[in-house]
Each structure stands twice: as C-alpha cells, then as structure tokens.
C-alpha cells in the first residue's frame, strides 16, 4: 500500500484536495476519496506531507499544517502530526518556506487521513512543492 | 537498494557532489556517479535530502533546494521535490537553518537523481547536517 | 522493528525523555530505556525526529536539534543528524517553528539512539508536535 498525492490548485476548502493520477502522483492499495487517503489494510504506515507556503507581503499570520485521521468509530479527528509557524518573516516583503511532517503510525482499515492548513491562498500547489503520501511498512 | 550520501565539502559545482563511503555514508544496490544516484532496479523508492544553509551576514538571498531526476529518454530534468526560502532572517546578522525533503517516487532503471541548491557557499557540508538518500520500498 | 515515541512534558534533562505507550506512541522490536531507543537487531533503519520550538518573546537564542548514537564500544557519541537555527524570528514577539530530521543509518545491536536539544523550556511536547521514531528497512 502506497500513495504520493500532489498539490491540486483547484483546492477550494479544507481538508486539502489532491492530485492522485498525473505527473509524479501514484496510488496503490489505498483509496483516494474527497481529499483523504482511505486505509484498506490495518498496519504500520509511514505518513508524510509537505506544504509550501508563500506570500506577496508578509504579515506573519499563523501558518498551520496538520495531518489528521478520521474514523467513523470515533467522534473526533485525531491529529497525527502538526506544525505551526509564528513570526517567520519580515513584514512587507515577499516570503516563502515549507513545512514537512513525517512519522510512523498504526492505522486501521477504513481510517481516513487528511491534510489541513490554515490559509489556502498562501499555498503553492506545484507537484514538487506540496504533497501528501504514505506507505505500508 | 539503499543509499545515504553525506555532504562533500569539495563540491564545487551543481549538482552537488557527495561522500558515499566514509562516516555514516552507505550505498548498496544503487550506484553513485558524478553527484547522482543511479537506479538499478525499477520500483518505488523513498527519496530524501537535507541541506543545512548558513551565512555570516543575512541578506535574504533566495535559497533553493531541489531533488531532481534525469533520464536519457527525456530531454528535461524532472523536479521531484523542492523547497524555496525567501525572507527568513534579519538582515546583517549570522543565520542558519535547514531544508528537508522526502517522498515516494516511482523510479526506473537508469534514472539519475541529483540535488541542486542555489548557493554552494552557504552550505555546511558536515555529514550530520547535509545529506541525500533513498531506499527501495 | 519499529518505534514512534512522542513528546513527554516531564522531560527534565538531556537527552529528551519520551512517551512510549499512550496515544499514538508505539514500540516493537526495539527497547525504550531512559530516553533512548536501544537497537535489538543489526541492520538498516530509517530514523526520524521532529521537535516543535516556541517562545513567548523571541531573542533568537540558538536552537539545536540532534539525533545521536551511543555505543559502549565507542567513547564518543556519534551525531547522526542535526539542525541548528540562528536568526529565525523578529525580536520581542511570540514565535514558533519545527525542526525535522530523517535519514537511513546502519545500526548495530545495542546501539542507543537519543535526541538532544538546546533548550527544554522552548519545546512543546504535544504528541503531534514533538516525536522520535525509527523503523527497520
């Protein structure tokens, strides 16, 4: 089971939507559904995501990047990994940087994994810059 | 197939050159050739790279870090992963930070993987700080 | 062999201590002992760590994040991966960011792996923000 999803510039809402077919994207043994990766087989997975944030005029608004898990058995989302950026650039100038997350988790069949970010308009969705993936160990 | 290449302070040009033998470096089932990792066996690979940038006096020049793929069948390089940093430090002071990239790609026998960066003089090549690797899933 | 250890807010000293049981933490085929992961079986491992730094008033004190290895056969610790941050925020304001490290290493039975950081008081130990793990390839 493996997936590498790449940035989709048509993302209009949270959680982020992804490209699962073209370019460097690939998916096998898991399903892609409405922004989420759906686990088919219970086991240990390495999960990763990178988001490339940039803006024309820095005002240091908080940047959040989360990978979270949802399962119909549990009422609340479980945040697996997250990053927050505060006070990262000089006001008034263009700015750019990425957030990277990656770790091992025990996932169960039917778990849905998503990526949440704080500001859609600040993301560059090029496939090499923003992505989300996993593979079964 | 696995490799972990470490920073080579004798790098004089782009793409970066690497240490493949001493210290924590290791290589097996792939070849190292003129800065590149050459894939022997088609399949899925997790590819990663970290670059440690630092400078004596910040002027916020753009920092680029790319992992790209070259194959004789294709005329152009394919950028697999990249990071750009702009507006990341207070002008005139010493500064330091790293860029980390890592993801899964479907690679083909004879693909060459390289790391490109924007400013050789701003890299610290210590083996624990700057590296490039992959392993076959 | 696999482990994912999460932030332990009761860490009072260096190396960092971790949670190995509750929440998203997991461990199998390696041992957790006084902040360290103890390798049972010689082989290749992907090792990773993320540390989330934050502070109430930026003074740009250096931030270090290291993954190092200790073995009774060697007198000195071996730093496998490290990150240093200097000049990363505007003085006097709240700030936050993470450091991520991950790479492949050839580890030997009885090797101990630890995480070292520069300033305990600047870390947020939530399980999704600060973690340390590995898995055998």
């Amino acid at each position: 089971s493996v997936a590498h999803l790449t940035g989709n510039p048509h993302s209009r809402s949270i959680p982020l939507e992804w490209e699962d077919t073209y370019g460097t994207a690939l998916i096998s043994g898991v399903k892609y559904k409405k922004g989420g990766l759906v686990i088919n087989e219970t086991g240990l997975y390495f999960v990763y995501s990178k988001v490339y944030f940039r803006g024309q005029s820095c005002n240091n608004q908080p940047l959040n990047h989360k990978v979270y898990m949802r399962n119909s058995k549990y009422p609340e989302d479980l945040v697996l990994m997250e990053e927050k950026r505060l006070n990262y650039c000089t006001t008034g100038q263009i700015w750019a940087h990425s957030s990277y997350l990656g770790a091992v988790f025990n996932l169960t069949s039917a778990d849905h994994l998503y990526v949440n970010i704080s500001q859609l308009s600040l993301i560059n969705f090029e496939e090499s810059k923003t992505f989300f993936g996993l593979y079964k160990l | 197939s696995v490799a972990h290449l470490t920073g080579n302070p004798h790098s004089r040009s782009i793409p970066l050159e690497w240490e493949d033998t001493y210290g924590t470096a290791l290589i097996s089932g792939v070849k190292y050739k003129k800065g590149g990792l050459v894939i022997n066996e088609t399949g899925l690979y997790f590819v990663y790279s970290k670059v440690y940038f630092r400078g004596q006096s910040c002027n916020n020049q753009p920092l680029n870090h790319k992992v790209y793929m070259r194959n004789s069948k294709y005329p152009e390089d394919l950028v697999l992963m990249e990071e750009k940093r702009l507006n990341y430090c207070t002008t005139g002071q010493i500064w330091a930070h790293s860029s980390y990239l890592g993801a899964v790609f479907n690679l083909t026998s004879a693909d060459h993987l390289y790391v490109n960066i924007s400013q050789l003089s701003l890299i610290n090549f210590e083996e624990s700080k700057t590296f490039f690797g992959l392993y076959k899933l | 062999s696999v482990a994912h250890l999460t932030g332990n807010p009761h860490s009072r000293s260096i190396p960092l201590e971790w949670e190995d049981t509750y929440g998203t933490a997991l461990i199998s085929g390696v041992k957790y002992k006084k902040g360290g992961l103890v390798i049972n079986e010689t082989g290749l491992y992907f090792v990773y760590s993320k540390v989330y730094f934050r502070g109430q008033s930026c003074n740009n004190q250096p931030l270090n994040h290291k993954v190092y290895m200790r073995n009774s056969k060697y007198p000195e610790d071996l730093v496998l991966m490290e990150e240093k941050r200097l000049n990363y925020c505007t003085t006097g304001q709240i700030w936050a960011h993470s450091s991520y490290l991950g790479a492949v290493f050839n580890l030997t039975s009885a090797d101990h792996l630890y995480v070292n950081i520069s300033q305990l008081s600047l870390i947020n130990f939530e399980e999704s923000k600060t973690f340390f793990g590995l898995y055998k390839l």
């Epitope: 024309q56 005029s57 006001t91 100038q93 | 916020n60 753009p62 702009l86 | -």
Partner: antibody, heavy 119, light 106 residues
Framework: QVQLVESGGGVVQPGRSLRLSCAAS????????IHWVRQAPGKGLEWVAV????????FYADSVKGRFTISRDNSKNTLYLQMNSLRAEDTAVYYC????????????WGQGTLVTVSS | DIQMTQSPSTLSASVGDRVTITCRAS??????LAWYQQKPGKAPKFLIY???SLESGVPSRFSGSGSGTEFTLTISSLQPDDFATYYC????????FGQGTRLEIK
C-alpha cells in the same frame, strides 16, 4: 541605466483580449519581481499583479483575478500581461514597475501603455 | 484590505512654502509606507520608502515621517519642479495606494 518599456496597448471591445509586454534593460531582470500597476484616466494608481523574479509565483488584485495572467520570459528580459474578458473599467494606462529587493514598492517604472476598452 | 486616505485632495501653495501631505491607513501598517510623485502624462517617481527613508537622488527637501496609521510627506521649501500629484502606498499587507494629493501653484 534601468529602463522599462511597455507596449501592446490599444483600443479593444469589451469581452475581447489583449496582451501587453514590458521590455526591461539596464539591470539583471531575472533577480527582480515585476509588477503591473494601472491608472484609469484622471484617477489614482491601482496595483494589478506581480510575478516573482523566477516566475514561480504570481499574485493578482481581486478586480482582475481569473481574467488577467502575468508571465515573464527571463531569457528575453520581458514581462507580459495577458488580459482576457476585458471590461470598460479596465480602461487605463498600464505601467510595469520593478520592485525593490523583494519589497512591495517600486523604484523604477515604465512610461505606460494605454488600454481603452470600448464598443 | 487596508484603505489609504490622503488629505488634502488638492493643495495650493507657492514656491518657497513648506507643505505637508497626510496619509492615513485604515489599520496599523507599522512603517511600511512609500511615497511617489507623478507629473501629468508621466510615470510615477519613487521618493520615500519605509515611511522616512529617502531614495537615493531625491532632493533632501523631501522628508517623510510617521508610523502606525498616520504618515506625512513634507516638502521643506517648494521648488517649481515639485508641483505634481503625490501618492502614498502601503506594503504592510499586499499593496494599496492613496487616492492622491494634487499640489498646485497658488
């Protein structure tokens, strides 16, 4: 010396398209962000769009988003503005302007090119 | 969006006068403000950045001050070449210009 020269303006009907160009000389074009700023007849200045030094990122004013596309060819030292679905309110003199070291202010401006959208 | 309001809209003055143009921001923009001069049929000319830093080559009779929401452009002794329209521009959050102040001969 730094020079920016716009061209491509003219009279066009509503709903039609036009492409403006801005030829740059006297500086290293590929290291500067370049903006388009417009000025309706007898009115003030309005920022339109920007493209980063390497062309990697572009930003637009809400009034033109989805209709205008900024691009550049660093090998030709040229900036472009593709204007589609033009409206009467797009009538203006269009200036290209160089930003100062990644700051959003403009140290050099072209002489402008007039775009008139009229039926 | 941050709105920039200049006052007065028109200012009549004579050669040798000291004149002040005010620019107000709808919210704090720290010192991230630039000033430009524009003459009829010409492109704007860059004068001041970061509220008070004079661009190289701009005569020292021009000065800027202010921070937060209130800013001023002062010309200490008007010269014939100074009669023009002046614009402020904030770059704290994207880019917006004031509506302009026309400085005319009294």
């Amino acid at each position: 010396q730094v020079q920016l020269v716009e061209s491509g303006g003219g009279v066009v009907q509503p709903g039609r398209s036009l492409r403006l160009s801005c030829a740059a000389s006297g500086f290293t074009f590929s290291t500067y962000g370049i903006h388009w700023v417009r000025q309706a007849p007898g009115k003030g200045l309005e920022w339109v769009a920007v493209i980063w030094y390497d062309g990697s990122d572009k930003f637009y004013a809400d009034s033109v988003k989805g209709r205008f596309t900024i691009s550049r060819d660093n090998s030709k030292n040229t900036l472009y503005l593709q204007m589609n679905s033009l409206r009467a309110e797009d009538t203006a003199v269009y200036y290209c302007a160089r930003d100062r070291d990644n700051w959003n202010y403009f140290d050099y401006w072209g002489q402008g090119t007039l775009v008139t959208v009229s039926s | 969006d941050i709105q920039m309001t200049q006052s007065p809209s028109t200012l009549s003055a004579s050669v040798g006068d000291r004149v002040t143009i005010t620019c107000r921001a709808s919210q704090s923009i720290s010192s991230w403000l630039a000033w430009y001069q524009q003459k009829p049929g010409k492109a704007p000319k860059f004068l001041i950045y970061q509220a008070s830093s004079l661009e190289s080559g701009v005569p020292s009779r021009f000065s800027g001050s202010g921070s937060g929401t209130e800013f001023t452009l002062t010309i200490s002794s008007l010269q014939p070449d100074d009669f023009a329209t002046y614009y402020c521009q904030q770059y704290n959050s994207y880019i917006t210009f004031g509506q302009g102040t026309r400085l005319e001969i009294k």
